[in-house]
């Protein structure tokens, strides 16, 4: 039941291995979620060496996996959201073929 897609491991930084993560980092919408929470002080690879990694998408660093992934914009896919999906207009195509 494990599926992995579009994950890139940032280069290991030995000085990070002693860090502990006690502060929350997921931003949530609505209610009190994500409010009054301090950001973690640790370096986020998305703000550094992976700043421009996601071409048409948002870079996300997953701490548990020590990996970077991209949340692609609509119609884009691929490891760096660099590929555009060529969606065919199936409804139009089918009506034209009749």
């Amino acid at each position: 039941s494990v599926r992995v897609e579009q994950v890139v491991k940032p280069p290991q930084n030995k000085t990070e291995s002693e860090n502990t993560s006690d502060k929350p980092k997921r931003k949530k919408k609505g209610g009190k979620n994500g409010k009054n929470r301090r950001n973690r002080k640790k370096k986020n690879p998305c703000n550094a060496e992976f700043q421009n990694f996601c071409i048409h998408g948002e870079c996300k660093y997953i701490e548990h996996l020590e990996a970077v992934t991209c949340k692609c914009q609509q119609e884009y896919f691929g490891e760096r959201c660099g590929e555009k999906s060529m969606k065919t207009h199936s409804m139009i195509d089918s009506s034209l073929s009749k």
Epitope: V2, R3, E5, N13, S17, R26, I62, H64, E66, K71
Partner: antibody, heavy 125, light 112 residues
Framework: EVQLVESGGGLVKPGGSLRLSCAAS????????MSWVRQAPGKGLEWVST????????YYPDSVKGRFTISRDNAKNSLYLQMNSLRAEDTAVYYC??????????????????WGQGTLVTVSS | DIVLTQSPASLAVSPGQRATITCRAS??????????INWYQQKPGQPPKLLIY???NKDTGVPARFSGSGSGTDFTLTINPVEAEDTANYYC??????????FGQGTKLEIK
């Protein structure tokens, strides 16, 4: 077959220390975050600690922060929990658990998909 | 911290009937339409076993009579129809990326 085998439990006096180990097999150990979860006799489950795939990120609840240290040796496929300044309320069965996950469209969803049989830690004078 | 409250604390159900366990979170565990709640079954003397992840997805090998639903702060585990072997404690757990990764206090299911 995924297997997690805990060891190192036993009887220890309050204020004492203990080191738990979890030997993992049947999967690529360094691809998964790992956790310790405990269960006091007759009580519910309590999350104790989590460590990221390479050990760079560790997480603890307030109840054990500063006393417990989680670590891992990916070369040995092993997870550890160093427990210091033990208290009577730390008495529990300690389980090691793997973080299964789904990763799609930039979303990461995880869950404890495999658990060891547990090792009993008793803190008593 | 997110607090999970399960109800009822215990219930007794006859074989063939429906068992419903609820889990209420003190704040939303949703993120962009994804619900970060998991359900576990624990039989006496055994470690917990994953039943449902991400609120409604059954783990491999989990019988069809188990189902999960809900979003936001309210989640439900349903067992229908209940079988004798379902006697166990059931726990919900929140798996956002925000520690602590809390569990509900548990629900004890007994078969009449």
């Amino acid at each position: 077959e995924v297997q997690l085998v805990e060891s190192g439990g036993g009887l220890v006096k309050p204020g004492g220390s203990l080191r738990l180990s979890c030997a993992a097999s049947g999967f690529t150990f360094n691809s998964y975050a790992m956790s310790w979860v405990r269960q006091a006799p007759g009580k519910g489950l309590e999350w104790v600690s989590t460590i990221s795939t390479g050990g760079s990120h560790t997480y603890y609840p307030d109840s054990v922060k500063g006393r417990f240290t989680i670590s891992r040796d990916n070369a040995k496929n092993s997870l550890y929990l160093q427990m210091n300044s033990l208290r009577a309320e730390d008495t529990a069965v300690y389980y090691c658990a793997r973080h299964g996950y789904l990763l799609y469209d930039g979303y990461y969803e995880w869950y404890f998909d495999y658990w060891g049989q547990g090792t009993l830690v008793t803190v008593s004078s | 911290d997110i607090v999970l409250t399960q109800s009822p604390a215990s219930l007794a159900v006859s074989p063939g009937q429906r068992a419903t366990i609820t889990c209420r979170a003190s704040e939303s565990v949703d993120y962009d339409g994804h619900s970060f709640i998991n359900w576990y079954q624990q039989k006496p003397g055994q470690p917990p076993k994953l039943l449902i992840y991400a609120a409604s997805n059954k783990d491999t090998g989990v019988p069809a009579r188990f189902s999960g639903s809900g979003s936001g702060t309210d989640f439900t585990l349903t067992i229908n129809p209940v079988e004798a072997e379902d006697t166990a404690n059931y726990y919900c757990q929140q798996s956002t990326e925000d520690p602590p990764y809390t569990f509900g206090q548990g629900t004890k299911l007994e078969i009449k």
